[in-house]
């Protein structure tokens, strides 16, 4: 454990003033694994003045960082870059004169407590005023800053000329694009202090490159992948005070593909499971032994899960018999193309010939996760498939 501190497997605390610490506590090699540390408590450490860029990076599991009644004057911009789990930061009663939002912008903080610090009234801390104004009143802190006359001024009253939130405006064409094509987005930003412009493309798969010059920026996306349909692209303007963003959703149109089609499985009903991708939503058509399959109450397509441009479902059959054995073909079609796949289904042997009523198909259960949704409502009464109801149909509830 670092000198002057105590440790457990998940916690480090350095609270005794004497002799105290002069640097952020670091674990010795071959001691506790720093990744397991979730809380660091530092108090009464008047000679601890700096958190360097690499001081905290080993504590990737850190959730709570408390440094109170100490001498903290400076925190490096990238000090918490690797600490994405940080939720609570308490820097009460230290010697901080300034603190940038750049320290914390990538963190999802529940608490940032900064009372009792001698902040200098400047644009650098205007973001704290903005943060206070957006928080609900029970959470607000009494933050003060020292003005030019070295008088304590409530942060709520802070007025700094030419110090405001930036703005971002995205001039995007219709962002519905065909797979394989390219598109260029333009963005302009403004504000004082002059903001920087950057693009947040998330986990965009398609190749992209950006150009930025002062307050203008462009993002070119080439050979657009269908995997990027539904993704959000944001233009972000950021300055000392805060950030603004303008976003668009990318819609990619592409021909359908049947990515999964398997032999029937039995649960409450028999199910021929399938997965289809396509945008716009493909129309689905089933064929039985080469002829169009007329869907009915007893044989119908059910979509269980829709994941943006991907549809997971079943051709559902009620009590199929040997009469329903055969080749089933699924065709998915939209204006960009079509795809089809076939499987052979064996539900039951012929009576008197084959008494095997439960063939060795894998018993994979297929859950109805959502209300079934029919897509591709196509029936053709002229090519009827034998009904799966071989019992007395008058007993059915219609």
């Amino acid at each position: 454990c670092p000198t002057s501190c105590k440790c457990s497997s998940a916690r480090i605390w350095c609270t005794e003033p004497s002799p105290g610490i002069v640097a952020f506590p670091r674990l010795e090699p071959n001691s506790v694994d720093p990744e397991n540390i979730t809380e660091i408590l530092i108090a009464n450490q008047k000679r601890l003045e700096i958190i360097n860029e690499d001081d905290v990076e080993a504590y990737v599991g850190l959730r709570n960082l408390t440094i109170v009644d100490s001498g903290l004057k400076f925190v490096a911009y990238k000090a918490f870059l690797k600490n994405s789990n940080l939720r609570h930061i308490n820097f009460t009663r230290n010697k901080l004169t300034s603190l940038s939002r750049r320290h914390f912008r990538h963190l999802d903080l529940s608490d940032l407590i900064l009372t009792g610090n001698p902040f200098t009234c400047s644009c650098d801390i205007m973001w704290l005023k903005t943060l206070q104004e957006t928080k609900s009143s029970p959470d607000t802190q009494d933050l003060y800053c020292l003005n030019e006359s070295s008088k304590n001024m409530p942060l709520a009253n802070l007025q700094i000329p030419n110090c405001g939130l930036p703005s971002a405006r995205l001039a995007a064409p219709n962002l519905t694009v065909e797979e394989g094509k390219s598109v260029t987005l333009s963005c302009s930003v403004g504000g004082d202090p002059l903001p920087t412009l950057y693009w947040d493309v998330g986990n965009l798969v398609s190749k992209h490159m950006n150009e930025t010059s002062h307050t203008q920026g462009s993002l070119r996306i080439t050979n657009i992948s269908s995997d990027d349909s539904g993704k959000q692209i944001s233009c972000v303007a950021e300055n000392l005070v805060g950030e603004d963003q303008d976003s668009v959703n990318l819609t990619v149109h592409f021909a359908p593909t049947i990515t999964f089609l398997e032999s029937p499985t039995s649960d409450h009903h028999w199910c021929i499971p399938f997965t289809v991708r396509g945008n716009p939503k493909p129309a689905l058509q089933w064929f039985y032994n080469g002829a169009i399959l007329n869907e009915s109450k007893y044989i119908c397509t059910k979509i269980h899960v829709t994941n943006h441009t991907e549809y997971h479902g079943c051709l559902q059959l009620d009590n199929p018999t040997h009469m329903n054995n055969g080749d089933y073909t699924l065709m998915a079609k939209n204006e960009y193309g079509k795809d089809e796949r076939q499987i052979s289904a064996h539900f039951m042997g012929r009576p008197g010939v084959d008494y095997e009523t439960n063939p060795n198909y894998p018993e994979v259960l297929y859950e109805d996760w959502t209300t079934p949704t029919d897509i591709g409502d196509t029936t053709n009464k002229s090519n009827e498939i034998p009904s799966t109801d071989v019992a007395d149909q008058s007993n059915r509830e219609h």
Partner: antibody, heavy 118, light 108 residues
Framework: QVQLVQSGAEVKKPGESLKISCKGF????????IGWVRQMPGKGLEWMGI????????RYSPSFQGQVTISADKSITTAYLQWSSLKASDTAMYYC???????????WGQGTMVTVSS | QAGLTQPPSVSVSPGQTASITCSGE??????VSWYQQKPGQSPVLVIY???KRPSGVPERFSGSNSGNTATLNISGTQPMDEADYYC???????????FGTGTKLTVL
């Protein structure tokens, strides 16, 4: 040489005020806490409070809060313990203590005997 | 932390090991220091941070701390070790240090 030198013995009457001192030599007085410890005749040691001369952050033991005032003047590397109205029960030896970067309260003054009697 | 409890007195023959205990709730979570005070003198630090010895303190002084108890051991005790011994720890509830009740060590 690192040392703390305390002011001399005091004999006072109840109700009188008093301020005793503790001057630091040979170390960075501003950057290390100073503490005051009471020892009544024939009794054990009791922490009264501590002060950080660099910013005058002061902590008092609950039993001494409001009874005494601890202060420091970093410009002359001196800490103080004062009473506004002494009582007979304040009769005791008072020690100041500080620490170096490695030790915990490893520097002690020689003590100041305060006698309060009518 | 309500306080630190020490035995009022411990007796030991010269050359033997003297053990003085200090008890307090979750004391192992705090650092413990030990002070020696001879009659008419200021206290002297003999152990800090549970088991560290300041320079000039003989090796026969050692310390340990775990659970609810800290211990000061003096091996090969000498007549010059006869004194009052106080443990000390940080009390986070009051943000101040607290001394133990003190133990008088007698070397028979």
């Amino acid at each position: 040489q690192v040392q703390l030198v305390q002011s001399g013995a005091e004999v006072k009457k109840p109700g009188e005020s008093l301020k005793i001192s503790c001057k630091g030599f040979g170390y960075s007085f501003t950057n290390y806490w100073i503490g005051w410890v009471r020892q009544m005749p024939g009794k054990g040691l009791e922490w009264m409070g501590i002060i950080y001369p660099g910013d005058s952050d002061t902590r008092y033991s609950p039993s001494f809060q409001g009874q005494v005032t601890i202060s420091a003047d970093k410009s002359i590397t001196t800490a103080y313990l004062q009473w506004s109205s002494l009582k007979a029960s304040d009769t005791a030896m008072y020690y100041c203590a500080s620490h170096t970067k490695d030790g915990t309260w490893d520097i002690w003054g020689q003590g100041t005997m305060v006698t309060v009697s009518s | 932390q309500a306080g630190l409890t020490q035995p009022p007195s411990v007796s030991v023959s010269p050359g033997q090991t003297a053990s003085i205990t200090c008890s307090g709730e979750r004391l192992g979570d705090k650092y413990v220091s030990w002070y020696q005070q001879k009659p008419g003198q200021s206290p002297v630090l003999v152990i800090y941070q549970d088991d560290k010895r300041p320079s000039g303190v003989p090796e026969r002084f050692s310390g340990s701390n775990s659970g609810n108890t800290a211990t000061l051991n003096i091996s090969g005790t000498q007549p010059m070790d006869e004194a009052d011994y106080y443990c000390q720890a940080w009390d986070s509830s009051t943000s101040l240090y607290v001394f133990g009740t003190g133990t008088k060590l007698t070397v028979l």
